[in-house]
């Protein structure tokens, strides 16, 4: 990995042992101001592998609300507008970091947690297994 | 929002003011052990809206490596294997949380940051604007 010289103005770490505890400022800095304003919000409806969005809420997690994609069909929508089972709608998944309150119900103490979320769906050619 | 009774065993907060600073245990708990073992790793190649994955590395960020999807074509791959420009390949984007070292180069002090990442691509019907 890359070694970075330590800034002498860093706060002291209360806990030098692992599991490592760090200080995190929850005042979120949003880097998305310069992103393309063309939102992907309607892609779930216009895709050849359309999906529905389900709200997953957990007050012990930060962020407490995460939207999960569920593919609407097993197949994909073809040029005529029919569900075609020669192709498959599949979820595109991503591992994301969330903060889990630990101990539970504590407002100022968290543990980093990795969860797998389905972000949307894409249409793929199926893998065909030929039986000898 | 939902009000949760505070656990009396919570650690004290060093800073009661906003921007709120909290303690975070970086010993990641991975909730993905029970997820479907069928990985989406080859979907980028099998999709009708295929994408390439680009490595984005930033040692001042946690996680330091994030993979960004870039759609391979403007159109989508049709049944003949050709790029069809009557359809559009578009990136599926998601806002994710990362930790940014603040002050820079500090091992134990972070700020929460929201960034927009492209996770994969999907094939959509274009929006056609009819000129009167």
């Amino acid at each position: 990995g890359i070694t970075i010289p330590r800034n002498p103005g860093c706060p002291n770490s209360e806990d030098k042992n692992f599991p490592r505890t760090v200080m995190v400022n929850l005042n979120i800095h949003n880097r998305n101001t310069n992103t393309n304003p063309k939102r992907s919000s309607d892609y779930y409806n216009r895709s050849t592998s359309p999906w529905n969005l389900h709200r997953n809420e957990d007050p012990e997690r930060y962020p407490s609300v995460i939207w999960e994609a569920k593919c609407r069909h097993l197949g994909c929508i073809n040029a005529d507008g029919n569900v075609d089972y020669h192709m498959n709608s599949v979820p595109i998944q991503q591992e994301i970091l969330v903060l889990r309150r630990e101990p539970p119900h504590c407002p100022n103490s968290f543990r980093l947690e990795k969860i797998l979320v389905s972000v949307g769906c894409t249409c793929v050619t199926p893998i065909v297994h030929h039986v000898a | 929002g939902i009000t949760i009774p505070r656990n009396p065993g919570c650690p004290n907060s060093e800073d009661k003011n906003f921007p709120r600073t909290v303690m975070v245990n970086l010993n990641i708990h991975n909730r993905n052990t029970n997820t479907n073992p069928k990985r989406s790793s080859d979907y980028y190649n099998r999709s009708t809206s295929p994408w390439n994955l680009h490595r984005n590395e930033d040692p001042e960020r946690y996680p330091s490596v994030i993979w960004e999807a870039k759609c391979r074509h403007l159109g989508c791959i049709n049944a003949d294997g050709n790029v069809d420009y009557h359809m559009n390949s578009v990136p599926i984007q998601q806002e994710i949380l990362v930790l940014r070292r603040e002050p820079p180069h500090c091992p134990n002090s972070f700020r929460l940051e929201k960034i927009l990442v492209s996770v994969g691509c999907t094939c959509v019907t274009p929006i056609v604007h009819h000129v009167a």
């Epitope: 409806n45 216009r46 895709s47 050849t48 359309p50 529905n52 609407r72 069909h73 097993l74 197949g75 929508i77 040029a79 005529d80 507008g81 029919n82 569900v83 089972y85 | 019907t125």
Partner: nanobody
């Protein structure tokens, strides 16, 4: 929630007309073919009429020249205009988006009787 809701069914005399509507919610119909099926008691479900995403229509042999399928993507609704109705058109009529693997409505009863 993704759903299709049919309306416009009812009791009509032979030779009469009805217009069925199929309103979609939770999704847009523009990417789908829109289809009307029917099922009479003791019979298999049969395709009555279909309109593709591009607007091409086709009809079951028994309803050709009497029924007309149409769609209004802006209203997110499909229609079935039924003229010169016969007693054998009596059935539950189902709206569908995307054909067999797609989205189905609950159905509306059409009864042709004097």
């Amino acid at each position: 929630e993704v759903q299709l809701v049919e309306s416009g069914g009812g009791l009509v005399q032979p030779g009469g007309s009805l217009r069925l509507s199929c309103a979609a919610s939770g999704f847009i119909i523009s990417i789908y073919s829109m289809n009307w099926y029917r099922q009479a008691p003791g019979n298999e479900r049969e395709l009555v009429a279909r309109i593709t995403r591009g607007g091409t229509t086709n009809y079951g042999d028994s309803v050709k020249d009497r029924f007309t399928i149409s769609r209004d993507n802006a209203k997110n609704t499909a229609y079935l205009q039924m003229n010169s109705l016969k007693p054998e058109d009596t059935a539950v009529y189902y709206c569908n988006a995307g054909a067999d693997g797609g989205i189905w409505g609950q159905g509306t009863q059409v009864t042709v009787s004097s």
